[in-house]
């Protein structure tokens, strides 16, 4: 259902001071400027809806320009507790504490928040990414070391009058950016506490948050150029489907990935692409300005709606799932990587999806909204879309029930 009913004051409208407060690019994440401590230390922090810790570099590291120096903050409090976060690849570990935190281009408030001071890491910080920490915006259930560590956004809402909602507009450039261009470029907006009408077109459509851990949603149908993949919808959500700004690609469960690639290959068969392209290993290139977008299909994900037996669909273009990559060896061409990949942990709607849409994380009403982003990359023939309603039966059966184990996968 679209969201046109009246809202409480301050919930909607214009948030000029927060527009354009993100920088970065899909391949290395989007970051917001934050200040920590007294006097304030400025850091760039990755916006990650796929984790729940606020963690910042707090020791020298070859990939960090700067780091949080706790000894220089008069308001730092040590929690005398360590935290260790392993990933499938890599890890970070650090010491827990609290300090005063604010977002210069965010709400005009300062909150005392938990901070993990990262003292050691492996395969976490990215060379040239320009961020020094991570802001985990998901729920306490997946916080480390356990769910008693209050996430930043919970602290923000508790300590201020900021409504329990944020929204993200991630703007993919549509062309590769070099380091100086990234530093100068606008990457999008994180609107804390509300929705900015200028950032989207059309209507917002909402899907329920299935469970408050990750931002888990339910996909009920997948189409490639309007052709149904015709899989048992449980496969689309095996073992979960999440919205994750800290992941680059659209990641799909193995069976779904294989079916989707087969269908995309068939739709784009006028050109023969190497197997390595579909694996994300080989680039495909065309003479500058001649990328044949029209030969690639659109991809539609149908999401459970707010009303029984009702769904809506979000549709992305090849401009979202072919990621521009700069390579000096082929600099005369426009080159791309296939940004859909295989997952063993369920569907991850990463930057590839989010760059098409304005995404509202309405925690207060346990739902996620999608509208066409005012900054998405498209051509004169096709545009990303959010459309509905569609009648879909037995959508509850599409959810997969995970056997209970402690699980947290960040920045995969």
């Amino acid at each position: 259902e679209t969201d046109e009913e009246p809202e409480e004051p301050g919930r909607r409208g214009s948030f000029v001071e927060m527009v354009d407060n993100l920088r970065g690019k899909s391949g290395q994440g989007y970051y917001v400027e934050m200040t920590v401590g007294s006097p304030p230390q400025t850091l760039n922090i990755l916006v990650d809806t796929g984790s729940s810790n606020f963690a910042v570099g707090a020791a020298p590291h070859p990939f960090l320009h700067r780091y949080y120096q706790r000894q220089l903050s008069s308001t730092y409090r040590d929690l005398r507790k360590g935290v260790y976060v392993p990933y499938t690849q890599g890890k970070w570990e650090g010491e827990l504490g609290t300090d005063l935190v604010s977002i210069p281009h965010g709400p005009n408030v300062t909150v005392r928040a938990n901070i993990a001071a990262i003292t050691e890491s492996d395969k976490f910080f990215i060379n040239g990414s320009n961020w020094e920490g991570i802001l985990g915006l998901a729920y306490a259930e997946i916080a480390r070391p356990d769910d008693s560590l209050e996430p930043f956004f919970d602290s923000l809402v508790k300590q201020t009058h900021v409504p329990n909602l944020f929204s993200l507009q991630l703007c993919g450039a549509g062309f590769p950016l070099n380091q100086s261009e990234v530093l100068a470029s606008v990457g999008g907006s994180m609107i804390i506490g509300g929705i900015d009408h200028s950032l989207y077109t059309g209507s917002l459509w909402y899907t329920p948050i299935r469970r408050e851990w990750y931002y888990e949603v339910i996909i009920v149908r997948v189409e490639i150029n309007g052709q149904d993949l015709k899989m048992d919808c449980k496969e689309y959500n095996y073992d979960k489907s999440i919205v994750d700004s800290g992941t680059t690609n659209l990641r799909l469960p193995k069976k779904v990935f294989e079916a989707a690639v087969k269908s995309i290959k068939a739709a784009s068969s006028t050109e023969k692409f190497p197997d390595g392209f579909w694996l994300g290993e080989q680039l495909v290139c065309w003479q500058a300005g001649t990328t044949p977008w029209n030969i690639f299909p659109v991809i539609s994900l149908y999401l459970m709606g707010e009303v029984t037996n009702q769904s809506f669909r979000i549709t992305i273009l090849p401009q979202q799932y072919l990621r521009p990559v700069e390579d000096v060896a082929t600099s005369q061409d426009d080159c791309y990587k296939f940004a859909i990949s295989q997952s063993s942990t369920g569907t991850v709607m990463g930057a590839v999806i989010m760059e098409g849409f304005y995404v509202v994380f309405d925690r207060a009403r346990k739902r996620i909204g999608f509208a066409v982003s005012a900054c998405h990359v498209h051509d004169e023939f096709r545009t990303a879309a959010v459309e509905g309603p569609f009648v879909t039966l037995d959508m509850e059966d599409c959810g997969y029930n995970i056997p209970q184990t402690d699980e947290s996968t960040l920045m995969t």
Epitope: P274, D275, G276, E281, Q282, D327
Partner: antibody, heavy 116, light 107 residues
């Protein structure tokens, strides 16, 4: 400037193992896969396998699956190839190469000599 | 595995000549073929990708052509520094495979 710096020549005994390295610079390391190749006189170039530095995913030529193991250390932008149970057949020049379209960049070569 | 066959092992040309090095794939590889030059004691150098596209910095006397199964690298106005082995490679499917090479000698 993109560079792939390979480790120096190795003289090893039959049955032993060796670990070759390839340090990358001049580009975003996690954006491109690294491949390893073998060249023996009169036998042309053979593709051994490849690794994705962003997540350590590997894919091997079936012929080298029991011989080579590829690993990566992103903190130093270095890829490694471990060759085990060496025989005289493994005496060769080994290259690392970076993906893109095909292999636009190659390392400078590492000579491995297996001799008692 | 896809076989890449370079039937001519050696070619001898004079400076200023035009030379065509051929390569045949055992099955259709589209345009997913690259060409490399390797001088004695050195690493291969990338010349051509996607059958006919020159990598940045490669002199325009090197041109590639072909698709499907038959591919050609042409060097027009051969120079003495072109003395080298030339290899084709298919990157259409795994495992990636190379031709056996063609040695260009300068008379």
């Amino acid at each position: 400037e993109v560079q792939l710096q390979q480790s120096g020549p190795e003289l090893v005994k039959p049955g032993a193992s060796v670990k070759l390295s390839c340090k990358a610079s001049g580009y975003t390391f996690t954006n491109f896969w690294i491949h390893w190749l073998k060249q023996r006189p009169g036998q042309g170039l053979e593709w051994i396998g490849m690794i994705d530095p962003s997540d350590s995913y590997t894919k091997y030529n079936q012929k080298f699956k029991a011989k080579a193991t590829l690993t990566v250390d992103t903190s130093s932008s270095t890829t490694y190839m471990h060759l085990s149970s060496l025989t005289s057949e493994d005496s060769a020049v080994y290259y690392c190469a970076r993906s893109g379209v095909a292999f636009p960049y190659w390392g400078q070569r590492t000579l491995v000599t297996v001799s008692a | 595995d896809i076989q890449m066959t370079q039937s001519q092992k050696f070619m001898s040309k004079s400076v200023g000549d035009r030379v065509s090095v051929t390569c045949k794939a055992s099955q259709n590889v589209g345009s997913n073929v690259a060409w490399y030059q390797q001088k004695s004691g050195q690493s291969p150098k990338s010349l051509i990708y996607s059958a006919s596209h020159r990598y940045s910095g490669v002199p325009d006397r090197f041109t590639g052509s072909g698709s499907g199964t038959d591919f050609t690298l042409t060097i027009s106005n051969v120079q003495s520094e072109d003395l080298a082995d030339y290899f084709c490679q298919q990157y259409n499917s795994y495992p990636y495979t190379f031709g056996g090479g063609t040695r260009l000698e300068i008379k």
